[in-house]
Interface confidence: low
Amino acid sequence: EDWQCPRTPYAASRDFDVKYVVPSFSAGGLVQAMVTYEGDRNESAVFVAIRNRLHVLGPDLKSVQSLATGPAGDPGCQTCAACGPGPHGPPGDTDTKVLVLDPALPALVSCGSSLQGRCFLHDLEPQGTAVHLAAPACLFSAHHNRPDDCPDCVASPLGTRVTVVEQGQASYFYVASSLDAAVAASFSPRSVSIRRLKADASGFAPGFVALSVLPKHLVSYSIEYVHSFHTGAFVYFLTVQPASVTDDPSALHTRLARLSATEPELGDYRELVLDCRFAPKRRRRGAPEGGQPYPVLRVAHSAPVGAQLATELSIAEGQEVLFGVFVTGKDGGPGVGPNSVVCAFPIDLLDTLIDEGVERCCESPVHPGLRRGLDFFQSPSFCPNPPGLEALSPNTSCRHFPLLVSSSFSRVDLFNGLLGPVQVTALYVTRLDNVTVAHMGTMDGRILQVELVRSLNYLLYVSNFSLGDSGQPVQRDVSRLGDHLLFASGDQVFQVPIQGPGCRHFLTCGRCLRAWHFMGCGWCGNMCGQQKECPGSWQQDHCPPKLTEFHPHSGPLRGSTRLTLCGSNFYLHPSGLVPEGTHQVTVGQSPCRPLPKDSSKLRPVPRKDFVEEFECELEPLGTQAVGPTNVSLTVTNMPPGKHFRVDGTSVLRGFSFMEPVLIAVQPLFGPRAGGTCLTLEGQSLSVGTSRAVLVNGTECLLARVSEGQLLCATPPGATVASVPLSLQVGGAQVPGSWTFQYRED
């Protein structure tokens, strides 16, 4: 019989229901915005905005200060008071729409939904390791703001993204706001603008450059700004918007907008469609060619990548990559395929595609009928003409006008659909050692920390845990403070270590010590932990073998049994070759001699399953007693593997030594030609791994084996005679004297 060890699913080596408690802060209301600050003298802070209030927290998430930002018109509003005596507009709650750091001062800038979307500047005051906010400055000059031209009207109640860039000594605010007809009519925020913060912090300089959705499209064409960031020479905005000005406005897609970070100009404003797809390795019948589109960006983050992912993306280590989580539509519910997919867009490649698109539009010969695009911002035109003009005049340049690049940038899901039903609502990517890790928040309030690799058919989890018991969605914006990430869910802010919350979710020593170095996991006798959790027994260099099963569960007291042991951490080397003298198996008092591994039996084990087998020959000692006993495997002096060495003992109960007893044989005669069906009855006849019925020394072919009965077909006899009949179990004869008589056929 060829018994094989049962597979253990890879998921059995971890438990994502393990509870982790991470530091948290209850903000007293739904968290609307969050930003962190780290000074160069060890001082740091977390700023958390909720409706009508701004909290200042220390690095330990303890409250340091709290500031009333609304309601507007309320005498208790501390920020409103900075604008002098009112009225300043209709009273109402202040929902924070913008919370950014101006690195030049440094200062915190907050902008809300009230008071025409104006902003407030709060100078930072380090106090030891904490930071306080100085009295706010109102970034609004009544004399130069009008409903139709308002440089100080920054935030839209429908949402605004801001990135601050230093150019020389000046701070430029790159602002992108969602508009509709009502918002546009009220102190006219712009869709995209670049505003310079005045040196005296009295507001933003007038005469700023801007693009806005044209009035005729405001009702039907809405742009959601999902993310903004600055890297290299550019500022980027990510949008979700209708694919066409003229077609169905519910058919959405994702675009990247690029603006110069070195010149406060919008002439080189460029847009590029980002196309993210799920392309399963085995395409279903009827599935679209090139994969299923996931056109709607939910969250995004850009980060430099580690060596392994860089290689897979064919870029250099440390290069900046834009990561986006995409869904099939606004509601996020797909037909088939995963709920969320993650695509990676190397920034250098984005820039190259944009530059090539400019060449196609502006360098002759220009393809006839190639449109400049962005018809929601500007008059329609064909390349190379400027917007609204039939031809290029000598003193204008094709390149100095906004452009939609004619080709899209297409990528496939890095996770190959493995996020499955998970709905990702937050994303932050970090590089740890050579590893690129995606820290994701989910719709049901969990954090997934997963290595970003594309070549696998399973997810490499750093962690997967629940932030709390509320199960509320994790919000889009994530901030970093030192070695921690700050996630918001409901009214709480949670501080999650970048290295993961702990190691207790790794259930086996092997899985524990194979964890990434940065996690600091070690084995503590019977659990995986960080050193502070179990300083006495914590170690990172060896794992004991682990026996999970063996076969058979019984063997004869006399005679040998071929014992197969199942488990993990037997070898560490894929070949499963065992150096001499490293593995010692005992069953009760009896040794079990290791057998060389049969290479013909080696079969590839999928990485999602794992099992190791070890075979040995059990020859009970004369002193061994009948009855139940333990199987023990001890491994010593094994050469180290890549992550650890195997060292230690594993014991498993449940083996029994038995004495087979033969009670009856029938019939006791049969034809010389053979073929008589012999029935041998007794006890413990099926123990061990080998048995043979011998008729005159020749094997009687076994047809059935059970604990109390053996059936076999007699071999042909040489002559008519009475011949000895014996039963051997494990090569040893079962006591008893039996004969079988061959008769004439």
Epitope: D433, H517, S575, P640
Partner: antibody, heavy 120, light 107 residues
């Protein structure tokens, strides 16, 4: 920037003992293991042993078992190797080299080496 | 102990040439081999780990291959700054051991 700074050159008499140091900077000291490697003049490299900078656990090359004692001072992020009962055979350059566990047993950063001369 | 045999002891090359260093282990060590460069009066520097895994900051002209007992380090276009001693090291078994080295010199 990762740095391993070793103490200066030493001239010692036969029979004496000496302690050489390797001060680490630019990385999380206790997450690593420190190797010590000997290089006699014009010869190859010989692994002496290593010490876990977190718990002080050591592993030695049997050849150097009574010759080298490895210790660590976490408070100063410094690893030490004491060489005992020195003979002319111990004249060599001694290197410390960081070992990153997850990357396996490759030595990714090395000290500048300390030249030890044993002579009467 | 595992013995690592490097050959040749000395390699003479001209700039721009492709060069290969050999390292043979006395027993099967999988891919647990690492390559180091040591310039005159300098410390060893890690070039390749686990037979073929590249190291951040090391020029792409350096590559490694092999498994089992035979390993190769290659430089696809030698530059003058590559003149140095090259050592292989195994991490399959205690004690960790190094090869005797190959000296790369200019013709």
């Amino acid at each position: 920037e990762v740095q391993l700074q070793q103490s200066g050159p030493e001239l010692v008499k036969p029979g004496a003992s000496m302690k050489i140091s390797c001060r680490a900077a630019g990385f999380s000291f206790t997450g690593y293991t420190m190797n010590w490697v000997k290089q006699s003049h014009g010869k190859s490299l010989e692994w002496i042993g290593l010490i876990n900078l977190n718990n002080g656990g050591t592993s030695h090359n049997q050849k150097f078992k009574g010759k080298a004692t490895l210790t660590v001072d976490k408070s100063s992020s410094t690893a030490y190797m004491e060489l005992l009962s020195l003979t002319s055979e111990d004249s060599a350059v001694y290197y410390c080299a960081r070992w990153l566990r997850r990357g396996g047993y490759a030595m990714d950063y090395w000290g500048q080496g300390i030249s030890v001369t044993v002579s009467s | 102990d595992i013995l690592l045999t490097q050959s040749p002891a000395i390699l003479s090359v001209s700039p721009g040439e492709r060069v290969s260093f050999s390292c043979r282990a006395s027993q099967n060590i999988g891919t647990s081999i690492h390559w180091y460069q040591q310039r005159t009066n300098g410390s060893p520097r890690l070039l390749i780990k686990y037979a073929s895994e590249s190291i951040s900051g090391i020029p792409s002209r350096f590559s490694g291959s092999g498994s089992g007992t035979d390993f190769t380090l290659s430089i696809n276009s030698v530059e003058s700054e590559d003149i140095a001693d090259y050592y292989c090291q195994q991490s399959d078994s205690w004690p960790l051991t190094f090869g005797a080295g190959t000296k790369l010199e200019l013709k």
